[in-house]
């Protein structure tokens, strides 16, 4: 059994979240995750879900009674979602910590917007990928 | 030229973000995007970046002088990042709008935590995928 399971059960007790009535009015995350099978779509959704949990855990960081549980779960998220890749986790954290009301940040975000947009479509990812698509189209056209 | 380019230039003027000094102290997003080539890693990062822009645009939603630019860019993000898939965009918006301080939301999140964690690793995505991996391992072992 993964270490997070026991600690998540501990959090359930703490938050009084074991009762069936907690599930009233639908789910937060599970229903949405069920909608998306494609790996890249799932990553889009899971990215928001993981950042939600990190924010939630930050809220309770001074709470000694659940400190160990929170740390264990965060560590396990790190293994599962970031493949224990510290750089990936750090970049992610950086992105979640930018403030939308800081004028310096606002300006930088707008300054970078055109380039960010150009990279949003999977096709735009790399020149290499674009080239291979062109070749593929060319091949199809000549068949 | 994509419609967002002209509108992004308009935003640059509004935010006074065209000057080269805006780029001082590194980039917000571009440097991070450069670090990740793998599509699923890029989606993890882009998910946070897109939600940042949506929050930023929300902050300026009543601002008449940039209303049209913001709407055009949001629409173009919708096309590029969500493939014009309304359901995908709606699910994403839902996730970004959950409040980490709402007790009901906290409880639901903790209630769903074990199942969310179980789905975080790509390998855990579907039973089908797990099975095919087991078969593959079995094949390799018997070679």
């Amino acid at each position: 059994q993964d270490p997070y399971v026991k600690e998540a059960e501990n959090l359930k007790k703490y938050f009084n979240a074991g009762h069936s009535d907690v599930a009233d009015n639908g789910t937060l995350f599970l229903g949405i995750l069920k909608n998306w099978k494609e790996e890249s779509d799932r990553k889009i959704m899971q990215s928001q879900i993981v950042s939600f949990y990190f924010k939630l855990f930050k809220n309770f960081k001074d709470d000694q009674s659940i400190q160990k549980s929170v740390e264990t779960i965060k560590e396990d998220m790190n293994v599962k979602f970031f493949n224990s890749n510290k750089k990936k986790r750090d970049d992610f954290e950086k992105l979640t910590n930018y403030s939308v009301t800081d004028l310096n940040v606002q300006r930088k975000a707008i300054h970078e917007l055109i380039q960010v947009m150009a990279e949003l479509s999977p096709a735009a990812k790399t020149g290499k990928r674009k080239r291979s698509q062109m070749l593929f189209r060319g091949r199809r056209a000549s068949q | 030229q994509d419609p967002y380019v002209k509108e992004a230039e308009n935003l640059k003027k509004y935010f006074n973000a065209g000057h080269s000094d805006v780029a001082d102290n590194g980039t917000l997003f571009l440097g991070i995007l450069k670090n990740w080539k793998e599509e699923s890693d890029r989606k993890i990062m882009q998910s946070q970046i897109v939600s940042f822009y949506f929050k930023l645009f929300k902050n300026f939603k009543d601002d008449q002088s940039i209303q049209k630019s913001v709407e055009t860019i949001k629409e173009d993000m919708n096309v590029k990042f969500f493939n014009s898939n309304k359901k995908k965009r709606d699910d994403f918006e839902k996730l970004t709008n959950y409040s980490v301080t709402d007790l009901n939301v906290q409880r639901k999140a903790i209630h769903e935590l074990i199942q969310v964690m179980a789905e975080l690793s790509p390998a855990a995505k579907t039973g089908k995928r797990k099975r095919s991996q087991m078969l593959f391992r079995g094949r390799r072992a018997s070679q």
């Epitope: 009301t101 004028l103 606002q106 | 003027k13 509004y14 935010f15 006074n16 902050n59 300026f60 939603k61 009543d62 601002d63 002088s65």
Partner: nanobody
Framework: QVQLQDSGGGTVQAGGSLRLSCAAS????????VGWFRQAPGKEREFVAR????????SYANSVDGRFTVSTDNAKNTVYLQMNSLKPEDTAIYYC?????????????????WGQGTQVTVSS
């Protein structure tokens, strides 16, 4: 002509809070964005925060973001600057300002109208 009356300054301990007010009268103030600037002794006047009269489009200087909150009350034609977790380096004269609404500027030379200023002193 627009008149701006700022008030609410005072002396407070580090970690404390103050709320500054800026009451506007005269010409339609809604044509402008509202900003707060501050000037510490021997320093240049610097941008603190900006907001539109609609209550949207908030921007803050990096040094105060997360501690200060700017808001508007249209009925009273007043803009507020709520300052929390004050630090000694926040000590300055704070000025309310009418700014262009079609660009976000931190340049005090582009301000149309100024309030008379209110002193904020944060002691350690």
């Amino acid at each position: 002509q627009v008149q701006l009356q700022d008030s609410g300054g005072g002396t407070v301990q580090a970690g404390g809070s103050l709320r500054l007010s800026c009451a506007a009268s005269g010409r339609t103030f809604s044509d402008y964005a509202v900003g707060w600037f501050r000037q510490a002794p021997g320093k240049e006047r610097e941008f603190v925060a900006r907001i539109l009269w609609t209550g949207a489009s908030r921007s803050y200087a990096n040094s105060v973001d997360g501690r200060f909150t700017v808001s508007t009350d249209n009925a009273k034609n007043t803009v507020y600057l709520q300052m929390n977790s004050l630090k000694p380096e926040d000590t300055a004269i704070y000025y309310c300002a009418a700014l262009p609404s079609n660009i976000i500027t931190t340049d005090y030379l582009r301000v149309y109208y100024w309030g008379q200023g209110t002193q904020v002193t944060v002691s350690s």
